[in-house]
Amino acid sequence: AWELTILHTNDVHSRLEQTSEDSSKCVNASRCMGGVARLFTKVQQIRRAEPNVLLLDAGDQYQGTIWFTVYKGAEVAHFMNALRYDAMALGNHEFDNGVEGLIEPLLKEAKFPILSANIKAKGPLASQISGLYLPYKVLPVGDEVVGIVGYTSKETPFLSNPGTNLVFEDEITALQPEVDKLKTLNVNKIIALGHSGFEMDKLIAQKVRGVDVVVGGHSNTFLYTGNPPSKEVPAGKYPFIVTSDDGRKVPVVQAYAFGKYLGYLKIEFDERGNVISSHGNPILLNSSIPEDPSIKADINKWRIKLDNYSTQELGKTIVYLDGSSQSCRFRECNMGNLICDAMINNNLRHTDEMFWNHVSMCILNGGGIRSPIDERNNGTITWENLAAVLPFGGTFDLVQLKGSTLKKAFEHSVHRYGQSTGEFLQVGGIHVVYDLSRKPGDRVVKLDVLCTKCRVPSYDPLKMDEVYKVILPNFLANGGDGFQMIKDELLRHDSGDQDINVVSTYISKMKVIYPAVEGRIKFSTGSH
């Protein structure tokens, strides 16, 4: 038997520095976790102790903190090279700055193979990108070889900006011929490394003949065997074992997100490349693991530019941006409108001639808006200002919900109106009218939503049975502020871009902003 140790990360989302337990900014260093310096310590420790080790990343290194905003992927290449990653799969967020924003900083600079079998380039891009990413790579490990085949969510055109010259094929259809090719090359140990979410990971394990192990990402799935070491609740055992259609036991793993854990999987292969056992667990990268001093020094050097950036002007406002709780928790506020407009603008994807855009709606809990911005400071808006408005380091995600769920959400928005509670919703692409004289749970008297399947956008009544796409904070997608109905009833959830980054990009693009209060939220006569 031959033993392989797979170390894996996924959905690191720009957490190069250590973070607090909830993956936001590190405040008390003795309680902080993750970060590349700490990760390197653990990886090196395992490399020294064990003979056959692979360090893999399942995508979405891009997007999540000011590190990505400033360095645009150069930081990913630099520190992944320093950690000596063996391979990476492309995630949807790797396309956030377009194909150029992937090619120049990452694909050309990475000293490790970057993989995806189901992304096919066409037109002029085909020759430009040729060889910069691969469908698979055969890696020598000790005296053996291991094939790694990559995959990426086929939803990427709806989630990011890959442009029109990349075709995202069905994962299973694209993977099978590549695995077959590896088999003809006498590679009998094959890892599928990719970024399509846990459900697709399990389907790949079940359907793709010849895949021995699946290392996934995208769904931030936490798997654990035994008592979990932090706050994350396991979605299943680690590894999660799938019986393939041809009767093999295929381990599937993921390691939550944000570099908080290092996935650690030990696989035993027989001489024919069959997996005969697998075990392991994610390793919590807490403060008991010291940060590597040389990587830490490098981080501190790269940090300097970030501090300068946060005080630079992004754009100007010529109006007061009212982010006060007195406004945003009680009525339509122009800061809420600005943020929702930025959220929709960030999700403009003209992928279908029938639709002007795939999504038109935004909801945002008023309690998530933490500060106003005064225009009397020469109108200047900086990253620092936005960090005061959106201090929680969340993301603006894409979900699919039935109209009935949205109706429940808007009822919840005002079920205890008047107590300055955070669940009061700010909106975009939605016109809502409340009647507060009615009993809680029956206060929404009108709810119109902006059409998407139209050439001239207009507002139509919400249909209870229709499925709608909505952009919202991850906090709401996870049921925060009492929006349990969203968490329980959502039909799809894809994590999006860092909240501050979305708003800062929008302001930079617009240069001068003047959001108004324009009647998105109304109260019917006599009740307010």
């Epitope: 399990k202 299943g236 055992k237 799938v242 019986t243 041809d246 009767g247 069959n274």
Partner: antibody, heavy 118, light 107 residues
Amino acid sequence: QVQLVQSGAEVKKPGASVKVSCKTSGYTFTNYYIYWVRQAPGQRLEWMGWIYPGNLNIKYNEKFKGRVTITADTSASTAYMELSSLRSEDTAVYYCARDDNYAWFAYWGQGTLVTVSS
Amino acid sequence: DIQMTQSPSSLSASVGDRVTITCKASQDVSTAVAWYQQKPGKAPKLLIYWTNTRHTGVPSRFSGSGSGTDHTLTISSLQPEDFATYYCQQHYSTPFTFGQGTKLEIK
């Protein structure tokens, strides 16, 4: 400890259907596969199919396709195997079994005797 | 389907004997073979999987070996409780198939 308790013996007429239950305890039902295996008198064991209660992934042995239906009730931690269009050669002891990561039929129910006779 | 053929079909032995049962697959099944013990009126009990991995609680006198098409179950020193019928099974590919069984009787 892991337990799989099956329903009692059944006598059926040719052409009828039988539904055998397998109630599990001592582990998380949705985390493991349940397999169905039968053994006719003096014959070898025969795998019929499986179900994964976690996502209801089901696979049948082609030999039984169209006649066998495997289901699971996660709230009751119980798996079911229904065999239709019964014939005399279906007289057998029917077992449910649970896997254990890399072992397929690691834990077995006590078996249910199904007799098909006119 | 892969056929699994056991030999012998039955054998007599005494307590303390070393016993070997073989199983031949109709095609290469690598090391994907399991062995079960069944006593009359009882469900089978898993002994070994992946050719040579003993299941939890199985005594060390039971061992397995082989690769490809030829596989072997060995009981190094027979105990009174070992008299039963033994089945091999391939878990190389679906449909999973079993051998016809080897009945081990007291001499």
